[in-house]
C-alpha cells in the first residue's frame, strides 16, 4: 500500500523515464546555479512537498538529490539565511519504513543527520545549518536540480 506522495513520486519518475532522450546539458540555464556537476534552481515561492516535486518535473528536472555530506554542505553554503527551509527529494516511505530518495534509493544513514521524526507524511527539508523532517503538507521553498553532462575530450584524426 503506497501513500499518495509515494505514488506521485513514482508516477513522475516513470513518466520521465518514458520521455525521449534529450541531448546532454553542458551549461546551466539562466537563473540556475551551477554546483559542481549539477544545476540548481532555488524556488522563490512556497509549496507542499508533492507540488514542489511536480514543479521540478515541469522544468525537466527533479527535486534535489544529495549524494553525501560534502554535497550537502556545499548546497547549504548557497542558502542565504538560517530561517529558510527548502524541500529536497527525500521523503519517508511508509511501506518500507525508511527514508527514500525520489530516484528509488534509500538514505544511507551516515549521509544526513536528520532532525525530527521518521514517520508517515514526513519529508526532508534543508536549511543553512541543518536537515529537518517536516510534515509534507508544509509550504516551504524547494530546490530543483538538473545534471550536467561531463564534457569528454574528443580525439580528432589528423586532416
Amino acid at each position: 500500500q503506497k501513500s499518495s506522495i509515494e505514488k506521485c513520486s513514482v508516477d513522475i519518475q516513470q513518466s520521465r523515464n518514458k520521455t525521449t532522450e534529450r541531448p546532454g546539458l553542458l551549461n546551466c540555464p539562466i537563473y540556475w546555479q551551477q554546483l559542481r556537476e549539477k544545476c540548481l534552481l532555488f524556488s522563490h515561492t512556497v509549496n507542499p512537498w508533492n507540488n514542489s516535486l511536480a514543479d521540478c518535473s515541469t522544468k525537466e528536472s527533479s527535486l534535489l538529490l544529495i549524494r553525501d555530506k560534502d554535497e550537502l554542505i556545499h548546497t547549504q553554503n548557497l542558502i542565504r539565511d538560517k530561517a529558510i527551509l527548502f524541500w529536497i527529494g527525500l521523503n519517508f516511505s511508509l511501506s518500507e519504513k525508511n527514508w527514500k530518495w525520489i530516484n528509488g534509493s534509500f538514505l544511507n544513514s551516515n549521509d544526513l543527520e536528520i532532525r525530527g521524526d521518521a514517520k508517515e507524511n514526513s519529508c526532508i527539508s534543508i536549511s543553512q545549518t541543518s536537515v529537518y523532517s517536516e510534515y509534507c503538507s508544509t509550504e516551504i521553498r524547494w530546490i530543483c536540480q538538473k545534471e550536467l553532462t561531463p564534457v569528454r575530450n574528443k580525439v580528432y584524426p589528423d586532416s
Epitope: H44, T45, V46, P48, R80, D81, K82, A83, I84, L85, R115, G116, D117, S122, S127, S130, Y132, S133, E134, Y135, S137, T138, E139, I140, R141
Partner: antibody
Amino acid sequence: EVQLVESGGGLVQPGGSLRLSCAASGFTFSSYAMSWVRQAPGKGLEWVSTISGSGGSTYYADSVKGRFTISRDNSRNTLYLQMNSLRAEDTAVYYCARGGLIPSGFDYWGQGTLVTVSS
Amino acid sequence: GIQMTQSPSSLSASVGDRVTITCRASQSISSYLNWYQQKPGKAPKLLIYAASSLQSGVPSRFSGSGSGTDFTLTISSLQPEDFATYYCQQTYSTPLTFGQGTKVEIK
C-alpha cells in the same frame, strides 16, 4: 475559521519567568510555522521568535536569545513561549501569529496577551 | 538586521482621498515585503504580501508596489474603517523587521 488565542500574560517581577500559550484551531497546525511578535505600549511591532511546523527549527531575535524558548505541541495544537530572566523592556503585548519562515508573512494573529515586568 | 523606514510617520486625510505610504529598506529585499493594518487595541491584519499581492478578503482599494529597496502602499479611496496604523515588514532575512508605522488619522 482560523483562531489563535493567547494566554499566560500577567505581572511579573524583573528576573522572573512566565510561560505564554497560544491555542490554535481551524487549520492543520503541524503544517505551519508559528511565531511570537510583541508590541511595547505605544510602540511598533517587534518579531520575537519563530518555530517550524515540526518544531525542529527555531529562530530568535537577538534581544531575547538565551532567555526565551519557543516550543509547540502539535498533538495539542498549542504554541508556547517560555520567558526567563525577564526585564522591564520585555513589557509588551505578545501576539501569536501564523507564519514566519522566509518568505512568508504573518497571515493570522491572536488577540494578544499583556506581559508587564515591574517591581 | 535590515532597517525598514516608513514615511510619513503620520498623516491626516479625508474619506475618499487617495493615500500613499512609503517604506524603504536599508538594503535590497527583492519583493519580500508585507503590509499590515492595525487598529487601536486590536491585532495587526495582513493586507499585502510579496510587495503587491492582495491578501484574501482585503478590499481592492488597497494595493502595493515596489521592489528592491522602495515600496509603496496605496489606498485608492480612503474609507472610514481605514483609519489605522500601517506597518511594512521585510521577510528577506532574519531578524524579521517592521517599519515604525504610519498613523492615518481623520482630517
